[in-house]
């Protein structure tokens, strides 16, 4: 990488190296030959997360409840607020700027992976021998009832949306 004129945590201004402001502080005035860089702490609801020469701190992210957001981790002078979604919702992006309702798996499909605050429900088709007869964000595919173990016989075959129907065995007269 190219040579730099200053030490780490310094910047070049007016042919002189000045100290950067530490995280959580903003630049008020550059250093001179006789004075150090002047920095001020960020205000309430503001932050700067790197060594910097910014004259303004960044505003903390607002977790808008109208968008289904809530605070997961409160911001500090050195870190931004982290938002997540209300129960039953998940973020639409990595930045979590808005939320959408968790997807439900339709009949014939079961939940492979339950949704989190940052990922949607993952559905999978119910394979042969399994069914789901509800639209749900939690229900997995259920196995068909085993008629034999109940000493019954299959009267109606199961599908991916319905269970088998068991009935009594025909008696010989």
């Amino acid at each position: 990488e190219p040579p730099t004129a200053c030490r780490e945590k310094q910047y070049l201004i007016n042919s002189q190296c000045c100290s950067l402001c530490q995280p959580g502080q903003k630049l008020v005035s550059d250093c001179t030959e006789f004075t150090e860089t002047e920095c001020l702490p960020c205000g309430e609801s503001e932050f700067l997360d790197t060594w910097n020469r910014e004259t303004h701190c960044h505003q903390h992210k607002y977790c808008d409840p109208n968008l289904g957001l809530r605070v997961q981790q409160k911001g500090t002078s050195e870190t931004d607020t982290i938002c997540t979604c209300e129960e039953g919702w998940h973020c639409t992006s990595e930045a979590c700027e808005s939320c959408v309702l968790h997807r439900s798996c339709s009949p014939g499909f079961g939940v492979k992976q339950i949704a989190t605050g940052v990922s949607d429900t993952i559905c999978e088709p119910c394979p042969v021998g399994f069914f789901s007869n509800v639209s749900s964000a939690f229900e997995k595919c259920h196995p068909w009832t085993s008629c034999e173990t109940k000493d019954l016989v299959v009267q109606q075959a199961g599908t991916n949306k319905t269970d088998v129907v068991c009935g009594p065995q025909d008696r010989l007269r």
Partner: antibody
Amino acid sequence: QVQLVQSGAEVKKPGASVKVSCKASGYTFTGYYMHWVREAPGQGLEWMGWINPDSGGTNYAQKFQGRVTMTRDTSISTAYMELNRLRSDDTAVYYCARDQPLGYCTNGVCSYFDYWGQGTLVTVSS
Amino acid sequence: DIQMTQSPSSVSASVGDRVTITCRASQGIYSWLAWYQKKPGKAPNLLIYTASTLQSGVPSRFSGSGSGTDFTLTISSLQPEDFATYYCQQANIFPLTFGGGTKVEIK
């Protein structure tokens, strides 16, 4: 007491590489930048670059960019300077030199060298 | 890069003489300047930093002055052990640069 002890003299052929070590003792190795300075026969002092032993960050003089690599091993408080593609005009005494403490400097780079290694003579000859 | 020009390149003097060496920077470097003494086969020895601050353990006959572009190293009364080469070095920005050196020889 502070000491910087360098590796011994080296004789190299043109095109080869050399790696010089500088073992620090008597102070907190990660608290001070380490610089490398060379003195060629009949020439003055020439700054080559620095390494921050704490972060591993480096800064090389433009002249040596692409040919020099400065590294460190904090577990043994040792800095290294490797120079590649050696030429006859790289024949010189190479010194490591300790800078002022990290955080000491607020304006300027304030790189003054209060402790030096004993020097390592590198001779490049075919 | 900042060029550092030292003068004279050599000076012949006797024990007890007052010796003055000057160093000029190609651009303003505030007070970010150091002076070193260098003897053959030895590592340099820091004498003065921030233009005028005497390094611990250095005799008070050495003094430095100047700021901006013009700097001076003065040896008020030359001693036998002072015969050496003296270098200035700017510490304002990287790359660090040294003057060409001034050799102080016995007259």
